[in-house]
């Protein structure tokens, strides 16, 4: 049997017997655009595409519009995959999205949703949620309904300011909202009493700015 | 460094009245709201009032409506809560918050609304004790 060469997602490369964890190149169906991702092939079941990571506030999450339509960062460290790419993957079938959180007490939680896509760029990347689970929080840091996202050259958010110039970070801002994964990165003991962290509001509350990060995704099967 | 400190807390009997203060510094007082919440025993946190000194912007929870007034003294960078015809349930450890005053919706800002949502608010203060007794 033939091996499969173009992978559109990390399950399509974990169910082609590749079940170490790396860095793998994607490509979408009907496309020849090649992005590189990370891909956890360990947890839960393994077929992890990671779209975004923060681990040590190695690269800028302060980006444009276009940087992150395409990706930016380092895919074995820390990065975004790119809103272009992940639209176009969750709308040709359904996909789950975890995110995973670190705090720098040690602790570790996650937030499960069971359906996860995002619109085109013309309707600005809008980000859709279904079924909540896990232990960051019975209600969504994410607002419901999901919001358009917003650059600090692109400003869709619900606010009279301009959320993602104040918080820093590209993000599905409310006005401004529960949350913010691309905020600013923050030192251990200067993490608290930040208003524009990393911040996943119903784990650890206002001012609050974690230790790491990961989103990732899988089809939902 | 934001600091915000709450006082006036203490014990009343049903009826009566109390007025909290919050005392800010590290920001400029006017680019601000100030929200006051409250956690009683064993319950979530909830809104209770907020001001925004620069328009005047305010808001009450339904359960104090009526009963309490928020104020603002700008030239002290000092907010105030009047807590009058207290009753038990509004036992509680009350907080001073601060998040920027435009950090609002349009339609808010057209409702001369701030936000009692609490994942707005970025500093808190430590907290003071209000205890009525029936």
């Known amino acids: 049997k033939e091996e499969q060469i173009s992978f559109r997602d990390c399950a399509e490369v974990f169910k082609s017997g590749h079940t170490t964890n790396g860095v793998y190149t994607l490509t979408l169906p009907n496309s020849t655009e090649e992005v590189k991702a990370y891909c956890d092939m360990e947890a839960g079941g393994g077929g992890w595409t990671i779209i975004q990571r923060r681990e040590d506030g190695s690269v800028d999450f302060q980006r444009t519009w276009k940087e992150y339509k395409v990706g930016f960062g380092n895919p074995s460290g820390e990065y975004w995959l790119g809103n272009e790419f992940v639209s176009q993957l969750t709308n040709q079938q359904r996909y789950v999205l975890k995110i995973h959180l670190k705090d720098w007490e040690g602790n570790e939680a996650y937030s499960l949703y069971e359906h996860f896509y995002l619109s085109s760029e013309e309707l600005n990347y809008r980000i859709h949620l279904k079924g909540l689970t896990g232990t960051a929080g019975k209600i969504s840091s994410i607002s419901q309904p999901g919001n358009d996202f917003s650059t600090k050259d692109a400003d869709n958010d619900k606010c009279i300011c301009k959320c993602s110039q104040m918080l820093t970070g590209g993000w599905w801002f409310d006005a401004c909202g529960p949350s913010n994964l691309n905020g600013m990165y923050y030192p251990q003991r200067q993490n608290t009493n930040k208003f524009n962290g990393i911040k996943w509001y119903y784990w650890k509350g206002s001012g609050y700015s974690l230790k790491g990060t990961t989103m990732m995704i899988r089809p939902a099967d | 460094e934001v600091q915000l400190v709450e006082s006036g807390g203490g014990s009343v009997q049903a009826g009566g009245s109390l007025r909290l203060s919050c005392a800010a510094s590290?920001?400029?007082?006017?680019?601000?709201?100030i929200g006051w919440f409250r956690q009683a025993p064993g319950k979530e946190r909830e809104g209770v009032s907020c001001?925004?000194?620069?328009?005047?912007?305010?808001n009450y929870a339904d359960s104090v409506k009526g009963r309490f007034t928020i104020s603002s003294d700008t030239a002290k960078n000092t907010v105030y809560l009047q807590m009058n015809s207290l009753k038990p349930e509004d036992t509680a450890v009350y907080y001073c918050?601060?998040?920027?005053?435009?950090?609002?919706?349009?339609?808010?800002?057209?409702?001369?609304?701030?936000?009692?949502?609490?994942?707005?608010?970025?500093?808190w203060g430590q907290g003071t004790q209000v205890t009525v007794s029936s």
């Open positions: 918050t601060a998040v920027p005053a435009t950090r609002r919706t349009p339609q808010m800002v057209d409702a001369n609304m701030c936000w009692l949502a609490e994942y707005e608010y970025d500093y």
């Open positions: 590290g920001f400029t007082f006017d680019d601000y709201a």
């Open positions: 001001i925004s000194s620069s328009d005047g912007s305010t």
